[in-house]
């Protein structure tokens, strides 16, 4: 039972996580305009990830797609592919934890494949949390870089007369989005790759089992092969109950580790 | 054409205050800030502050706070201005106008006269 | 504040004349989010309201002649009329949308010979 909640908390956890992610990459809202000055402003700047928002005291606001691909500065393409690696991951580490849930029921489906998927599905979450949260951290060093930087040239430019007021940009709700988000599926993945730990069954291990069969009996190890019993090499262990051979099936496969991007 | 009907004009005392209005019908009226101007005779315009016309916030330029004081009333789309404390400085012509891209003011209301006399 | 100063304070011309008027702000207009500069031009007619001709320095309002033109940035402007008609006889006010508070010329007086 608290395997199964652990398991659903960590689905849904992650959900709103991953939710958060898109959120966060499809967000205006990266940086904006630094107020700190002017606390009332006519013309409020804000950018995102794909565009540049201009907010007019009016109410008027025009957004601008970054058309160009080669133009923008490779750090701003790095978060962008942060921040779609994570959803890419997230969105089929849902998929895979679907069918994981212990609740939900499908064919003939194992427990051990149960296992095997919800640590799958913990992992991925894992990487894609922290492919946001970096993503975010980013573009965060970026603009404290930057920030910096403006005020370094405001109060070296201002011999003139006339004034050029530089705009300075801080960060924007989005980024408190992605490492919230971010977080969350962080947070979604450990607990289901817990949830896993009580999903596999435990591996018994028999040194020899007793064989009952009318009229002889034959004792074997598991994995032997016995040509005049009619078996194939069997790998699997047998549990053996009383008054007849039952078999139950008990594997126990553990994934090969893979370096997701 | 959006027209903006300001009230007639006032003839006020020196201390008094003084409510003048700027309705505008025929078109949404929550869609724009709603703007003041102050033209006096002969001079040059000065804004004296804007009031959101949905949310109610305002801002003012600063020569103008506790002289001006702005409303809205969006169930017959009108706008206020109350002037307190009135001098001979503030006889003028105020215009309300409406505010749109570029934080431009495309449509002016006919002005308010206000004349401060004794 | 931004102070605009606006030259000459008041011109003569024929009409039929082409006619430049200049609007300077003390600090720059020009948006560097947009890349557009919040100036506005504003004709009243003696007796009248106000009229908006020209946002964001260079765009024309809808129903305007297209013998007024604006152009400048950053904190130089000017308005441009390339034949005056005797109705262009106004007082012309550029405006700083900027930044609060919203501040006007002292406005260019166009008198028609």
């Known amino acids: 039972m608290a395997v199964t909640a652990c398991q659903g908390l960590g689905f849904v956890v992650s959900l709103i996580g991953i939710a958060g992610i898109i959120a966060a990459t499809c967000m205006d809202q990266w940086s904006t305009q630094d107020l700190y000055n002017n606390p009332v402003t006519a013309v409020f700047n804000y950018q995102g990830l794909w565009r540049s928002c201009v907010r007019e005291s009016s109410g008027f606001t025009e957004c601008r797609g970054y058309f160009t691909l080669l133009g923008l500065p490779a750090m701003l393409q790095a978060v962008r592919a942060l921040m779609i690696v994570g959803i890419v991951l997230g969105a089929i580490g849902l998929l895979v934890s679907i069918f994981a849930l212990k609740c939900i029921r499908i064919g003939s489906m194992e427990d051990s494949a149960k296992a095997n998927m919800t640590l799958t599905s913990g992992i991925m979450f894992i990487v894609s949390g922290l492919c946001a949260i970096a993503g975010v951290s980013v573009f965060a060093n970026m603009l404290v870089t930057n920030f910096w930087m403006s005020t370094a040239n405001m109060y070296t430019g201002m011999g003139g007369m006339v004034q050029t007021v530089q705009t300075r940009y801080t960060f924007g709700a989005a980024l408190f989005v992605g490492w919230v988000a971010g977080g969350l599926t962080l947070i979604g993945g450990v607990m289901m790759c817990i949830a896993c730990r009580g999903l596999a069954p435990e591996e018994t291990n028999y040194k020899a089992v007793s064989y009952h069969a009318s009229g002889h009996s034959v004792a074997y190890k598991p994995g032997g092969f016995k040509a005049s019993t009619g078996f194939g090499s069997n790998t699997k262990n047998k549990k053996i109950y009383d008054g007849g051979a039952r078999t139950e099936d008990e594997v126990q496969s553990y994934p090969s580790k893979h370096d997701y991007v | 054409e959006i027209q903006l009907q300001q009230s007639g004009a006032e003839l006020v005392k020196p201390g008094a205050s003084v409510k003048i209005s700027c309705k505008a019908p025929?078109?949404?009226?929550?869609?724009?800030?709603m703007n003041w101007v102050k033209q006096s005779h002969g001079k040059s315009l000065e804004w004296i502050g804007n009031?959101?016309?949905?949310?109610?916030?305002?801002s003012y330029n600063q020569k103008f706070k506790g002289k001006a004081t702005l409303t809205v009333d969006r169930s017959s789309s009108t706008a206020y201005m109350q002037l307190n404390s009135l001098t001979s400085e503030d006889s003028a012509v105020y215009y309300c106008?409406?505010?749109?891209?570029?934080?431009?003011?495309?449509?002016w209301g006919h002005g308010t006269l206000v004349t401060v006399s004794a | 504040d931004i102070v605009m100063t606006q030259s000459p304070s008041s011109l003569t011309v024929t009409v039929g004349e082409k006619v430049t008027m200049t609007c300077k702000s003390s600090?720059?207009?020009?948006?560097?989010?947009?890349?557009?500069?919040?100036l506005t031009w504003y004709q009243q007619k003696p007796g009248q309201s106000p009229k908006l001709l020209i946002y964001?320095?260079?765009t024309r309002e809808s129903g305007v002649p297209e013998r007024f033109t604006g152009r400048g940035s950053g904190t130089d402007f000017t308005l441009t009329i390339s034949s005056v008609q005797a109705e262009d006889l106004a007082v012309y006010y550029c405006?700083?949308?900027?930044?609060?508070?919203?501040?006007f010329g002292s406005g260019t007086n166009l008198e028609i010979k």
């Open positions: 600090q720059s207009l020009l948006n560097s989010g947009n890349q557009k500069n919040y």
């Open positions: 964001w320095a260079s």
């Open positions: 025929g078109y949404s009226f929550t869609d724009y800030n």
């Open positions: 405006q700083n949308g900027y930044s609060y508070p919203f501040t």
């Open positions: 009031i959101n016309s949905y949310y109610g916030s305002t």
């Open positions: 106008t409406n505010f749109d891209r570029g934080n431009s003011f495309p449509y």
